[in-house]
């Protein structure tokens, strides 16, 4: 007995399509072996028509395909534009046609029902709207118009121009009679039901002069579309329900074990908490279509999803729907990356974002998920360098480490930064991922002055203190701009033994600007990294001003009278603890003096540290 299974009998009508699904045990060998669909001839041989290796016979060209779904041990043969010649005996199988792993399928294609001459065929999905057109002659213009449904040998009145409506069609049918000169009336049926399927008769007038037109209404069940996406990746459900419901509330729901449908998200503001931070309902187009994006896919997201329209924002019988069956592939191409990243107030986070490594040239983006109404995700930063204004000086997107991962650094954290953020590109949408930033109790590890005022033409020295745990990390200073953070040249960093015992006094990396110019004004970051993996950062704003009085050292009142929560550092620069500086102008009155001494030799901007630079693992 063959382990392959499928439908023994498939029947359809000319012009239709069939989708034949064959099941096989999903062993490793079976998953990767050739799949085929062949037709049995009189000789007993089975001639291949289509296979998983790309072969399509001339008879099937342009109208058939075979798709293998190895994750769940199935393959599907789609055949369109059926003709009666397609009737016959077939096999779906694995391996070689003449061997045992196959299943016999009988396909019967019939002519379709005999319809009265001139019958118009309307094919519409359940829940949608149909408009039946009924022509008539001038002499019948003033006479009664009606639509009947033929049931067996009898005709049942559905609607007429005398305001009769059959109870089965109540509140979802209307008969429209146009103005003079137009010799056609229409019957519009909304929210079609399967029971509406059948043959209808339009009639205008009575007696032997009456006008008649037959209409065959075929109401189709929406067959769920199979969607296969990777664990941790993203799925987009595109939902087009038609203009008739363009102004009706929309929803996406998931079918539960009781076969009712739980709302996942709707346009009335409802959202399932299981999808918090990782779902967006994109605004609908003029035609009423919309899409729902879910990121950070989990195995438990698998299931059947329906999108629909109804004023209550949830599933109701007879209203249009679209269906999907979502499968989440655990053998994911999307690498694991932290879904939660923690930082302290005043500190920083470095977020690793995966992207499709085949799309290294794609634009990279980072956005903040906002849950209000249908959800939105305004972009905060992109790889071309645009940064939202309120994130100036504290947000940067780096292409490193590359090869399928980019890095986003956010510093000067406040509790308001807690939330969900999305990593995305302008390429493969399935690689959208979500990360949650949580702000926890604690102190930043890197300590820099709150903000600094440098004097034009003089030397500025900014210290950055770091704890022993970063002694083996690479330390750097960089100047922030909206296109990134340009690393500043580093001086000779002294003996590598300096940190063997992690000397309290030597845990310092300093930035020297000599001489200070106008172009030096801006944000500077002190940071640690290991290879291409970035760790913590701290930011300081440097304001540049003219010399006050030649030869004198100006000390601001704020410096002379330091507040209790401020530590005065030995470089003559104040550190304001736990302040997340968003806008340097708020601190304009706090001026701190720069060193006046000229630095002999070396680069104009330099980083000074006595740290040993051991390349270690990741600081993720």
């Amino acid at each position: 007995k063959s382990p392959v299974f499928g439908p023994q009998e498939v029947s359809s009508v000319e012009g239709n399509s069939v989708s034949i699904k064959c099941y096989y045990p999903p062993t490793s060998v079976n998953r990767h072996t050739r799949k085929y669909w062949c037709r049995k001839g009189a000789s007993g041989r089975c001639i291949t028509l289509v296979s998983s290796e790309g072969y399509v016979s001339s008879n099937y060209a342009g109208r058939a395909n075979l798709t293998n779904f190895p994750e769940n041990g199935t393959f599907v043969v789609n055949i369109a534009q059926l003709s009666r010649d397609d009737s016959g005996h077939y096999k779906c199988g694995l391996g070689i046609n003449s061997r045992g792993l196959s299943f016999d399928v009988s396909l019967e294609v019939s002519q379709g029902p005999e319809l009265p001459n001139g019958t118009e065929v309307y094919t519409v999905d359940v829940g949608r709207t149909v408009t039946i057109k009924c022509p008539f002659k001038t002499e019948n213009a003033p006479k009664t118009k009606a639509l009947y449904k033929k049931i067996g040998q009898t005709s049942v009145l559905v609607i007429d121009s005398r305001n009769y409506v059959n109870p089965n069609y109540k509140d979802r049918i209307r008969l429209r009679i146009p103005g003079t000169g137009q010799l056609i009336f229409t019957v519009v049926i909304d929210r079609l039901r399967l029971s509406d399927h059948g043959l209808y008769l339009c009639q205008a007038g009575d007696g032997s002069n009456r006008d008649e037109k037959n209409a065959d209404l075929q109401v189709l069940e929406p067959e769920p579309e199979l969607v296969y996406e990777d664990l941790r990746g993203s799925v987009t459900f595109h939902c087009a329900l038609g203009l008739e419901v363009a102004n009706v509330a929309k929803f996406l729901c998931r079918v539960n074990s009781r076969e009712t449908c739980d709302v996942v998200i709707n346009t009335l503001g409802k959202r399932d908490s299981a999808f918090e931070g990782r779902i967006l309902l994109n605004p609908q187009d003029k035609d009423g279509s919309f899409s729902v994006v879910i990121t950070g896919l989990r195995k438990e997201d698998e299931g059947r999803y329906l999108c629909g329209a109804h004023s209550d924002g949830q599933l109701q019988e007879g209203w249009p729907i679209q269906a999907w069956q979502l499968f989440v592939n655990e053998e994911s191409t999307i690498p694991r990356s932290p879904t939660v990243v923690k930082g302290v107030a005043g500190g920083s986070v470095a977020v690793l974002c995966p992207y499709n490594p085949k799309e290294s040239q794609s634009l990279k983006y980072w956005c903040l998920w906002e849950g209000a109404q249908n959800g939105r995700c305004p972009l905060l930063v992109e790889s071309q360098g645009l940064v939202q204004e309120q994130y100036e000086g504290r947000l940067s997107l780096l292409q490193e480490p590359g090869n399928g991962t980019f890095t986003v650094i956010l510093n000067q954290l406040t509790t308001q930064d807690a939330g969900f953020y999305w990593c995305l590109t302008n390429g493969d949408t399935r690689w959208r991922t979500t990360v949650e930033i949580k702000i926890i109790e604690g102190e930043p590890n890197l300590k820099v002055p709150g903000n600094v005022t440098a004097v034009l033409g003089e030397t500025l020295n900014i210290p950055c203190h770091f704890p022993c745990k970063f002694s083996s990390y690479e330390k750097y200073w960089c100047k922030w701009s909206n296109t990134g953070c340009q690393t500043l040249p580093s001086q000779d960093e002294g003996p590598s033994e300096a940190f063997v015992n992690c000397d309290e006094n030597s845990r310092l990396v300093s930035l020297t600007l000599n001489p200070v110019t106008r172009a030096d004004e801006g944000w500077y970051w002190c940071g640690v990294k290991q290879g291409h993996f970035y760790g913590e950062t701290a930011a300081v704003y440097v304001a540049v001003e003219e010399k006050k009085v030649a030869g004198s050292r100006y000390v601001s009142p704020a410096k002379a009278d330091a507040a209790p929560d401020e530590k005065v550092l030995d470089s003559g620069v104040r550190e304001i603890e736990n302040k997340a500086i968003q806008d340097p102008r708020l601190f304009a009155e706090e001026k701190v003096v720069a060193d006046t001494g000229d630095q002999a030799g070396g680069s104009r901007a330099s980083v000074d540290s006595s740290s040993s630079e051991e390349q270690g693992g990741s600081s993720k």
Epitope: E9, S11, Q218, E221, S257, R258, E317, I321, Q325
Partner: nanobody, 126 residues
């Protein structure tokens, strides 16, 4: 909720025929596959036959033991599915259950069906 009501079971002689009916009512959204399972005393419930449809296309699935003896069909207008059982054998004795689903992942799998009837007894004497 979908309600399924089976009928047509009974006591017959080996070699005789029976026709089971399953009427569906009260749907919340489209059902597009209905089938029959059976459970003999002391055994697990097993797949017998399923019919799936999409517009005017139908797909019929049968268990190996059926071997051309059983035929599944449906009447769209009546929302009813039938199982015509010919050449019945004593080993066909079981309670026959009707099942329906809105999505058919695998016709043979019990968990692919969301709705179930109460069952109808078929007894075949030798």
């Amino acid at each position: 909720e979908v309600q399924l009501v089976e009928s047509g079971g009974g006591l017959v002689q080996a070699g005789d025929s029976l026709r089971l009916s399953c009427a569906a009512s009260g749907r919340t959204f489209p059902t597009y596959a209905m089938g029959w399972f059976r459970q003999a005393p002391g055994k697990e419930r097993e797949f017998v036959a399923t019919i799936r449809w999409s517009g005017s296309t139908q797909y019929k699935y049968y268990a190996d033991f059926v071997k051309g003896r059983f035929t599944i069909s449906r009447d769209n207008a009546k929302n009813t599915v039938y199982l015509q059982m010919d050449s019945l054998k004593p080993e066909d004795t079981a309670v026959y259950y009707c099942a329906a689903t809105t999505l058919l992942t695998d016709p043979r799998a019990l968990n692919a069906y969301a709705y179930w009837g109460q069952g109808t007894q078929v007894t075949v004497s030798s």
